[in-house]
């Protein structure tokens, strides 16, 4: 069947449309196009006789039509009047006629719309606003957008006039948004520029900042007022009901107690005609005195004296606070506060109690701090230390010994050699020493304030020959894979080289072996049972050398997984069962046996005479090393068969 398809069906003014012919019969004489739904010579657009290759325009021809050999008709530069039906009249070679009708609709390209408003400055909770989308256009659909979103569902929003008018009832400040309208028809869509709704509102109840209402005499009072309002509010300040100034901020420098009172901020909106006020009560306090600390003991002795610190002056109904080292007071049985917190007592002071200490007086506004106080705790002297630590010297060198003992006030020092007083200095110096200078060197430290004295004695040997060294150890029984051992070669001697041997060999290269302290210390990390060897240290200088006796490292290890022997697991009835358990361990482990989970005996060997099939089962050997705290075990299954049925064992 002959049909006409309009491409497109909805056409924009100024564009073109193709009336496309489908199922055109063969063997045609010609065809004609007509405007309308029927063949009417007065409304012929164009006619075409096949073979002439020339079309004949009709009365309805506008010059915008192009006819094609396949009978399709193109209409260019479409106008509104072109809307409607078009009929194709086909004449076949047998002069039989056929007709088909198509249609299209013409729509204008829409202009860019604009929004008109009936109220440019609506008042919140009072006015309504009607937006209208201009211009009014036939066959157009109207849409609205708020902040580029489609309209929210709201009983205050109403569309009317074919959606061309958007009414907002009882506007609120939240309706201050970007509004756009859009016009649509089948061929175009255009969106307006945005219109911002300017809702007048407020003022809301003003807020006064800052919120604090208590001030100290001498401070500056700076109050700021703000109220949500459109247009912005005009502000006025009243103090105790008396007008002060028309500003958003109120500033009063160097206030006194007389500035206490009620401060009112009034916000006014000239467009809405509304006023709102907020009142705050300001209290100005007199400045309190700066506190200070008194002490009942300015030079307390460590571990003997107590000290009472008192915060002055005494003021009724006042809170006293204390700080030590800029921290609040630590919890300690040696710190005691009086009932009113004004006195802090330190019981049995130590050198660590020096402070600084601060006290504070708290009033309504702030805390006033005292200046810091530092305690002068008398202590010591502690046991003096003599340096350097060398005990062996060669003849001809200088001996220079220094003594130090922690003490407050600093200690006074005296030196004695073999009990004879030498000098009252911190350092002892003897040049070009000889063997005669060997002896006991005593440093005595004395604290004149506490009256205490402490001494330290050091044996000095002056000899060309080095002494026989010895090895000291920090761990006599290290546990395998757990402990480290540090061997130190004694004594410490000046200008001496330290050497080490293991089992008569020089030290092997190993990441677990480390030399330190001028090679005087040998550390073995993560000891193993293989480290249980003979260790020897040696010392040498330019005139002599000496070696220590060997020290054998006793490494505790195990118990390893035990082994049960013999390995046999099948026995004949009547045979003797003699199982021996062994586990590598240092010290030797304790052994115990279980048969089928039942404890038996605490021996290394398990003996059962003349076994029977009743002796079938699991035999477990348990080993434990009390020194390493480790345990281990193994289980063996024993099968006893009746006489003569064993697969290969005989009694």
């Amino acid at each position: 069947k002959l049909t006409i398809e309009s491409t497109p069906f909805n056409v924009a003014e100024g564009k073109e449309v193709l009336l496309l012919v489908h199922n055109l019969p063969q063997h045609l004489f010609g065809y004609s196009w007509y405007k309308g739904e029927r063949v009417d010579g007065n409304r012929q657009i164009i006619g075409y006789v096949i073979g002439t290759q020339q079309a004949t325009p009709g009365p309805a021809y506008s010059g915008r039509e192009i006819i094609y050999p396949n009978a399709s008709l193109l209409i260019q530069n479409i106008i509104q009047n072109d809307t409607g039906f078009y009929t194709l009249h086909v004449i076949k070679s047998d002069l039989v006629n056929e007709e088909a009708t198509g249609q299209f609709r013409v729509y204008p390209e829409l202009p860019k719309p604009s929004i008109s408003s009936n109220n440019s400055k609506p008042v919140e909770d009072k006015d309504a606003v009607a937006f209208t989308c201009e211009p009014e256009t036939q066959d157009a659909t109207y849409l609205w957008w708020v902040n580029n979103q489609s309209l929210p569902v709201s009983p205050r929003l109403q569309l009317s006039n074919g959606n061309r008018t958007l009414t907002l009832f009882n506007v609120t400040r939240n309706d201050t948004a970007s509004y756009k309208c859009e016009t649509q028809n089948p061929v175009s869509a255009r969106r307006s520029d945005s219109v911002i709704l300017n809702v007048l509102y407020g003022p809301d109840a003003p807020t006064i900042s800052p919120l604090n209402t208590s001030y100290r005499s001498g401070e500056n009072l700076n109050l700021s007022c703000h109220a949500a309002s459109n247009p912005p509010a005009q502000y006025s300040w009243f103090v105790n009901g008396t007008f002060q100034q028309s500003t958003q901020e109120l500033f009063i420098p160097n206030i006194t107690v007389n500035n206490s009172g009620s401060y009112t901020c009034q916000a006014h909106n000239s467009d809405t005609g509304l006023n709102r006020t907020t009142v705050t009560t300001i209290t100005v306090y007199a400045e309190p005195p700066k506190p200070f600390i008194t002490s009942n003991n300015s030079n307390p002795v460590e571990d003997e004296d107590a000290v009472a610190l008192t915060c002055e002056p005494e003021i009724q109904n006042t809170t006293y606070l204390w700080w030590v080292n800029n921290q609040s007071l630590p919890v300690s049985p040696r710190l005691q506060l009086s009932n009113d917190n004004r006195t802090l007592t330190l019981l049995s002071v130590t050198r660590n109690d020096v402070g600084p200490y601060e006290c504070g007086i708290q009033n309504e506004l702030s805390v006033d701090h005292s200046d810091p106080v530092i305690l002068n705790v008398l202590y010591g002297p502690d046991d003096p230390t003599i340096s350097p630590s060398y005990t062996y010297y060669r003849p001809g060198v200088n001996l220079s010994l220094s003594c130090h003992a922690a003490s407050n006030p600093p200690a006074q020092y005296s030196w004695l050699i073999d009990g004879n007083i030498q000098q009252h200095t911190q350092e002892l110096f003897i040049s070009n020493i000889t063997e005669k200078n060997s002896g006991l060197y005593t440093c005595q430290a004395n604290n004149s304030a506490s009256g205490h004295s402490r001494t330290t004695v050091k044996t000095i040997t002056v000899s060309a020959e080095l002494p026989k060294p010895s090895i000291s150890s920090n761990n006599s029984k290290p546990v395998e894979d757990k402990d480290a051992v540090a061997f130190t070669c004694e004594p410490e001697a000046q200008n001496t080289t330290y050497l080490w041997w293991v089992n008569g060999q020089s030290l092997p290269v190993s990441p677990r072996l480390q030399l330190s302290n001028g090679n005087r210390t040998l550390t073995l990390f993560n000891v193993t049972r293989n480290d249980a060897r003979a260790y020897v240290c040696g010392i040498q200088n330019s005139v002599s050398a000496n070696r220590s006796d060997p020290v054998t490292l006793d490494v505790l290890y195990g118990p390893d997984t035990p082994i049960i022997s013999p390995p046999d697991s099948s026995y004949l009835s009547g045979a003797n069962l003699n199982l021996s358990c062994h586990s590598a361990s240092n010290p030797s482990p304790q052994y115990s046996w279980r048969i089928n989970g039942i404890p038996q005996q605490h021996t290394q060997v398990l003996f059962i005479a003349k076994i029977t099939p009743n002796n079938n089962g699991t035999y477990a050997c348990f080993v434990s090393n009390l020194a390493t705290g480790r345990n281990n075990s193994i289980v063996k299954s024993i099968t006893v068969s009746a006489s003569g049925t064993s697969p290969g064992l005989s009694a």
Epitope: G51, A55, S62, G63, R64, P69
Partner: antibody, heavy 118, light 106 residues
Framework: QIQLVQSGPELKKPGETVKISCKAS????????MNWVKQAPGKGLKWMGW????????TYPDDFKGRFAFSLETSATTAYLQINNLKNEDTATYFC???????????WGQGTTLTVSS | DIQMTQSPSSLSASLGGKVTITCKAS??????ISWYQHKPGKGPRLLIH???TLQSGIPSRFSGSGSGRDYSFSISNLEPEDIATYYC????????FGGGTKLEIK
């Protein structure tokens, strides 16, 4: 796209015959008539007539009856202009042009220059 | 045969200006007139048909009007690429070109 490609320039003597070709592509050759247009040096355009590519029937205006002949090779989608007994005044550029069904000359060849000189 | 008288045969105008060419037919041609632009070495280009209908892709600077025997063609806002010879063509009965108008830019 629709294209009309004409044969190259010709140099002839008076009394000779020339045959200019116009090869069409990009459309159904037998749906549209083919026109021929002359432009003598320094002169304007002159319509020489057209040939119905469906029936092969030519049409000539009075000025071009006699020595001028239009022909077709439909299988090759080619139209021809033949001028017999060439004269000096035949010196010109000759254009072929497709005519749509409303006889608008909407597509043109690039032109073929004919020079007739003794 | 129908005769077409085109005037002027040449004219000069300024860039951005406007020019008008006329064609007079020896008899009523029922608006069946088209206008062509012809540049040397190329085939002519169809600008307007049926008196005033712009061919697809032709800028709106070109326009045509007229009826009966008298027709005109205008180019506004002249551009350098408009330099060419312009012809009218009647197609009411057979076809006849006008004599042409050569357009130059001042």
């Amino acid at each position: 796209q629709i294209q009309l490609v004409q044969s190259g320039p010709e140099l002839k003597k008076p009394g000779e015959t020339v045959k200019i070709s116009c090869k069409a592509s990009g459309y159904t050759f037998t749906d549209y008539g083919m026109n021929w247009v002359k432009q003598a040096p320094g002169k304007g355009l002159k319509w020489m007539g057209w040939i119905n590519t469906y029936t092969g029937e030519p049409t000539y205006p009075d000025d071009f009856k006699g020595r001028f002949a239009f022909s077709l090779e439909t299988s090759a989608t080619t139209a021809y202009l033949q001028i017999n007994n060439l004269k000096n005044e035949d010196t010109a550029t000759y254009f072929c042009s497709r005519g749509d069904l409303l006889v608008r000359l909407d597509n043109w060849g690039q032109g073929t220059t004919l020079t007739v000189s003794s | 045969d129908i005769q077409m008288t085109q005037s002027p045969s040449s004219l000069s105008a300024s860039l951005g200006g406007k020019v008008t060419i006329t064609c007079k037919a020896s008899q009523d041609i029922n608006k069946y007139i088209s206008w062509y632009q012809h540049k040397p070495g190329k085939g002519p280009r169809l600008l307007i048909h049926y008196t005033s209908t712009l061919q697809s892709g032709i800028p709106s600077r070109f326009s045509g009007s007229g009826s009966g025997r008298d027709y005109s063609f205008s180019i506004s806002n002249l551009e350098p690429e408009d330099i060419a010879t312009y012809y009218c063509l009647q197609y009411d009965y057979l076809r006849t070109f006008g004599g042409g108008t050569k357009l130059e830019i001042k």
